[in-house]
Interface confidence: medium
């Protein structure tokens, strides 16, 4: 990713008065209604062949504040019989989000977008058997 | 949902104001550095007994502007023979994401954050049978 | 997935001229802003050329401009430009890249394409 500082699209904006003055509104909107906020975990990380735990990353200075990251339980998947398969593998889908963070000391408060890639929780595929050539 | 300052920080800064008035540094963005957003999408959605595809949701006037969203395959999970276990349930991972919307003809540059709630991928879950009483 | 592939650099005497040509792919190009960015050896990202989605508006960094000249074709979800009067300073690697609501910030660019003025 990459900033270029130039700007056009408010031609009497200068590129180095804009990278400093870009507001944003953070009353957060939710697209999809209240419930977003407020919808319970599920209990797939429990349920699933590919189990996983969450981990509290808590950051007083980002917003969110609280992001809860996956990690895989196993290496492997576990079977019908709660045994764990050799041949299937519990891996992390990670998904990139946007934080907002606080710059240091910043009156008024001065945020920065900032990038993550966490793990959202885990599925299970067949391991791939390298064969010698 | 709201981002309220601590009042000890900015004592002069209403929360009203605050919440019209902050300003968003862009200079620093990717806190994984570039590679982030090229990194190639992985081959999990295949070779997962939850496979998932893949559709583009895309909005210009939103940031990111294309998000993929994921959409389980199937009802069920494949088992090793590739059939399709009617015991085991493929259930969609979603996660809550921020996304920054234009206002509309701001200059300077301003934007609302959003929230999104977004497929990821999908997993393999035991069917829960519920029996009569 | 998102695409963008540049072609047409080279080597080129000062005075002479090329077009570059970027393929895109993986998103709607006529509802975007499209741009030209260059590095040049040991130097930081320039932006150099900006075009509106219908092709509309056009923006030029203050080294180019009269030279070089930015074009879209949506039909075919290509961008290009058109570079005249080449000068030893505009020796680089040229990337195009897909606008985003966020200004001057690029998520998604090719991989570049080397344009080389000398003698």
């Known amino acids: 990713a990459a900033i270029i500082p130039q700007s056009s699209a408010c031609p009497n904006t200068e590129a180095k008065d804009f990278l400093q003055n870009v507001k944003v509104n953070l009353k957060v909107f939710n697209s999809l209604g209240a419930k977003v906020s407020s919808r319970r975990p599920s209990d797939y990380l429990n349920r699933s062949t590919s189990p996983w735990t969450l981990h509290r990353n808590e950051d007083p200075d980002r917003y969110p504040s609280v992001i809860w990251e996956a990690q895989c339980r196993h290496q492997r998947c576990v079977n019908a019989e709660g045994k764990l398969d050799h041949h299937m593998n519990s891996v992390l889908i990670q998904q990139e989000i946007l934080v907002l963070k606080r710059e240091p000391e910043s009156c008024p408060f001065t945020f920065r977008v900032e990038k993550m890639l966490v793990g959202v929780g885990c599925t299970c595929v067949a391991s791939i058997v390298r064969q010698a050539a | 949902a709201a981002i309220i300052p601590q009042s000890s920080a900015c004592p002069n800064t209403e929360a009203k104001d605050f919440l019209q008035n902050v300003k968003v540094n862009l200079k620093v963005f990717n806190s994984l550095g570039a590679k982030v957003s090229s990194r190639r999408p992985s081959d999990y959605l295949n070779r997962s007994t939850s496979p998932w595809t893949l559709h583009r949701n895309e909005d210009p006037d939103r940031y990111p502007s294309v998000i993929w969203e994921a959409q389980c395959r199937h009802q069920r999970c494949v088992n090793a023979e590739g059939k399709l276990d009617h015991h085991m349930n493929s259930v969609l991972i979603q996660q809550e994401i921020l996304v920054l919307k234009r206002e509309p003809e701001s200059c300077p540059f301003t934007f609302r954050v959003e929230k999104m709630l977004v497929g990821v991928g999908c997993t393999c879950v035991a069917s829960i049978v519920r029996q009569a009483a | 997935e998102v695409q963008l592939v540049e072609s047409g650099g080279g080597l080129v005497q000062p005075g002479g001229s090329l077009r570059l040509s970027c393929a895109t792919s993986?998103?709607?190009?006529?509802?975007?802003?499209m741009y030209w960015v260059r590095q040049a050896p040991g130097k930081g990202l320039e932006w150099v050329a900006e075009i509106k989605q219908d092709g509309s508006e056009k923006y030029y960094v203050d080294s180019v401009k009269g030279r070089f000249t930015i074009s879209r074709d949506n039909a075919k979800n290509s961008l290009y430009l058109q570079m005249n009067s080449l000068r030893a300073e505009d020796t680089a690697v040229y990337y195009c890249?897909?606008?985003?609501?966020?200004?001057?910030?690029?998520?998604?660019w090719g991989q570049g394409t080397l344009v080389t003025v000398s003698s």
């Open positions: 890249a897909k606008g985003e609501i966020l200004p001057l910030y690029f998520d998604y």
């Open positions: 993986g998103f709607t190009f006529s509802s975007y802003g």
